[in-house]
Interface confidence: low
Amino acid sequence: EVEKTACPSGKKAREIDESLIFYKKWELEACVDAALLATQMDRVNAIPFTYEQLDVLKHKLDELYPQGYPESVIQHLGYLFLKMSPEDIRKWNVTSLETLKALLEVNKGHEMSPQVATLIDRFVKGRGQLDKDTLDTLTAFYPGYLCSLSPEELSSVPPSSIWAVRPQDLDTCDPRQLDVLYPKARLAFQNMNGSEYFVKIQSFLGGAPTEDLKALSQQNVSMDLATFMKLRTDAVLPLTVAEVQKLLGPHVEGLKAEERHRPVRDWILRQRQDDLDTLGLGLQG
């Protein structure tokens, strides 16, 4: 806490400018009007304030807005955002995507901080769902964002938003997350033709049920082994040897190298040896 002291004569700030970098902490506290600071927040980032000086400016805003900052101030916080705690951010009501982008830009290149996570949570909850524009923005800044959400949170993603998802955005998703995302992707891409559909749906197939895999096996998709290994075990088990052969196409030879791994191992165990022998791979059920 900075002590309340009178502002020295002639030092009262008329505007937020570079002269303030020469003010001591107590002078900033005494001579900078909080309302002036709030209206000229966009200037703060252009001025090389020290971290200690930024603490004073934050303190002034906190006093002016004890219930949380208005969006007009939040949008121009810039590097002052890094001084905010998750508790501060929980008081905000951020509705503008531009505000979100501005604050994410400040943290760009760093891992998602608790502050950013809280900001995103507040923003998404305020919107009621994770719409396409928001998802586009978040995955651009944090490719792993989607996979940081719980299955419950993912359930609020509308199918239309799935168009914004790139394969790399799903790299760290676990099976239960893909279980939620797959039906949404299937709905989103349902009007595409066979080969285009497979390209789009491929990254989501870790959540696909058996009947969808059977349907894909009839479309000459030539699924690669990496994708096959990410399929749900319970979805793979009922597939026949012929269906797996059609599903994988020329990649079927890769089953041998994966015969001890799930889901291939479990699938092999449930096949008739005669059927497995037709593959000519030496697989033992």
């Epitope: 792993g144 996979c147 940081s148 959400l149 719980s150 299955p151 760290t172 998703c173 676990d174 239960r176 997350q177 075990t233 319970d234 088990l237 791994h261 799930r262 479990d266």
Partner: antibody
Amino acid sequence: QVQLQESGPGLVKPSETLSLTCTVSGGSVSSYYSTWSWIRQPPGKGLEWIGYIYYSGSTNYNPSLKSRVTISVDTSKNQFSLKLSSVTAADTAVYYCAREGKNGAFDIWGQGTMVTVSS
Amino acid sequence: DIQMTQSPSSLSASVGDRVTITCRASQSISSYLNWYQQKPGKAPKLLIYAASSLQSGVPSRFSGSGSGTDFTLTISSLQPEDFATYYCQQSYSTPLTFGGGTKVEIK
């Protein structure tokens, strides 16, 4: 051969926070196929799943404990941790860390650590 | 949450006996059912995963069957080292849940 080892205080006072760490050796916490769980067992009772974490940091907690639980992962140290806040005597248990592996089961367990909540 | 109900809660048997433990899920869990053995003072040990697959290193006298909601763990010929408590666990959906356990005691 992947092994897990729990560490942390054996005695915690009521209303305080229980903190445990699980160190993974012989393998990586960043395995695509694994989630890393905490499971507890009160004396003479059954097993209760607390929650899991994936190496990306994605978590899933048991709703019965969600308001008090935080699980985190440190890939650089090959560790994951449990924090359980506002503990009471009912939280006295053996706490296990475990790997949910490619087969969808807890195939590797730590030896367990007994945590007593008492003043 | 999916409730897992094991029966019986305890049983007495002799060496060489065939022992069957059942586990029922409150809703369908496909084949996402695992079985564990726990001895006093030790961590549980995985026996069977995906309802019927034997974990590496586990004796072949242990077997599992079932799908959907009803599952069975069978020990074809009980050995002295098999006296322990057995738990089923579903990994179909979170929260992951365990059965209450079945204690196998010496008759």
